[in-house]
C-alpha cells in the first residue's frame, strides 16, 4: 500500500478515503513533493504582505512587502515599516538619528560616526544624521600650514602627466 | 474561520471624537496583542497602536496623548478612543493580531480587518 502513495506526484495527495487513490490537491492548497498524505493549505499574503507568486497545486504562494515595508525573516516571514534616510524605527514610530549618529538605508538602526582619530585620521568631511563622516590623512600627514579639511592632491596614475 | 470586524467609523469635525471597536472570533483573543493601522487617501500603511496581551500599550508620536487603545478580553474586542482628531487623520483604519510584538512590524500570520473610514472635515 506505501507503494501506491510513492507514485502520486506533487500537486496531488493520497487519497486513504479512496483506497489510496492519487487525488488533486484542493483549491488553495499545494504539495510540493510526490508521496504526500495531505496537501498544505496555501500561504495567504493579506494586511502589508502583497503577492509576488501565486500558489499553485504544486508550491506555496510568496510574498513581498508592500511600499514603504520591507522584508524581514527567511521567505519574508515579517513586514517592517520603512524609516527614511537619517532616522530609525523607535517604540513611537520613525526618529531622527541623534546627533553623532547616522542611517544611510530606510531600514536599520542608526549607528554611531566613523572616530577618524582612533585611525590616527583626521575629519575629512563632517557626518550628517544619513551619512558618516569621511576621513582623511592624519594631521601629521598634512603639510605645515595646511588645514585639516584641505583633501589631498589626487594621485597621479601612471602614464598621465599632471594637469 | 478567524474573523475581525470593525466598527465605529464616521464623519466628525476637527476636535471632535470617534471610538472605534475590532470584535474578533476564531482565536485566542484573550492571548493575542493586537494593533491598529490606517491607511490615508494616496499614502501608504502606518502602524498606529498596538496592545500587548498583558495590557501593555504603544502609540506612533502622531497620535500619542490624543488616541487611546484598549481592550476587553471578555468581549473578544479591542477599541481605538479617538481624540481631538485632524484632518490627517482621515484615513481607513484596519485591526490587525500583532504577533511580532514589533512596532510597525506584522508577521505573514497575523489576521485582518475589512478597515472602517474615518474621515474628519469640516
Known amino acids: 500500500l506505501q507503494d501506491l502513495c510513492s507514485n502520486c506526484p506533487a500537486g496531488t495527495f493520497c487519497d486513504n478515503n479512496r483506497s489510496q487513490i492519487c487525488s488533486p490537491c484542493p483549491p488553495n492548497s499545494f504539495s510540493s513533493a510526490g508521496g504526500q498524505r495531505t496537501c498544505d493549505i496555501c500561504r495567504q499574503c493579506k494586511g502589508v504582505f502583497k503577492t509576488r507568486k501565486e500558489c499553485s497545486s504544486t508550491s506555496n504562494a510568496e510574498c513581498d512587502c508592500i511600499s514603504g515595508y520591507h522584508c524581514l525573516g527567511a521567505e519574508c516571514s515579517m513586514c517592517e515599516q520603512d524609516c527614511k534616510q537619517g532616522q530609525e524605527l523607535t517604540k513611537k514610530g520613525c526618529k531622527d538619528c541623534c546627533f553623532g549618529t547616522f542611517n544611510d538605508q530606510k531600514r536599520g538602526i542608526c549607528r554611531p560616526w566613523t572616530n577618524c582619530s582612533l585611525d590616527g585620521k583626521s575629519v575629512l568631511v563632517n557626518g550628517t544624521k544619513e551619512r558618516d563622516v569621511v576621513c582623511g590623512p592624519s594631521p601629521a600627514d598634512l603639510s605645515p600650514g595646511a588645514s585639516s579639511a584641505t583633501p589631498p592632491a589626487p594621485a597621479r596614475e601612471p602614464g598621465h602627466s599632471p594637469q | 474561520e478567524v474573523d475581525l470586524v470593525e466598527s465605529g467609523g464616521g464623519l466628525v469635525q476637527p476636535g471632535g471624537s470617534l471610538r472605534l471597536s475590532c470584535a474578533a472570533s476564531?482565536?485566542?483573543?484573550?492571548?493575542?496583542?493586537m494593533s491598529w493601522a490606517r491607511q490615508a487617501p494616496g499614502k501608504g500603511f502606518e502602524w498606529v497602536s498596538g496592545i500587548y496581551s498583558g495590557g501593555s500599550t504603544y502609540y506612533v508620536d502622531s497620535v500619542e496623548g490624543r488616541f487611546t487603545i484598549s481592550r476587553d478580553n471578555a468581549k473578544n474586542t479591542v477599541y481605538l478612543q479617538m481624540n481631538s482628531l485632524k484632518p490627517e487623520d482621515t484615513a481607513v483604519y484596519y485591526c490587525?493580531?500583532?504577533?511580532?510584538?514589533?512596532?510597525?512590524?506584522?508577521?505573514?500570520?497575523?489576521?485582518w480587518g475589512q478597515g472602517t473610514q474615518v474621515t474628519v472635515s469640516s
Open positions: 476564531g482565536f485566542t483573543f484573550s492571548r493575542s496583542a
Open positions: 490587525a493580531t500583532w504577533g511580532s510584538q514589533q512596532i510597525g512590524v506584522w508577521h505573514e500570520d497575523d489576521y
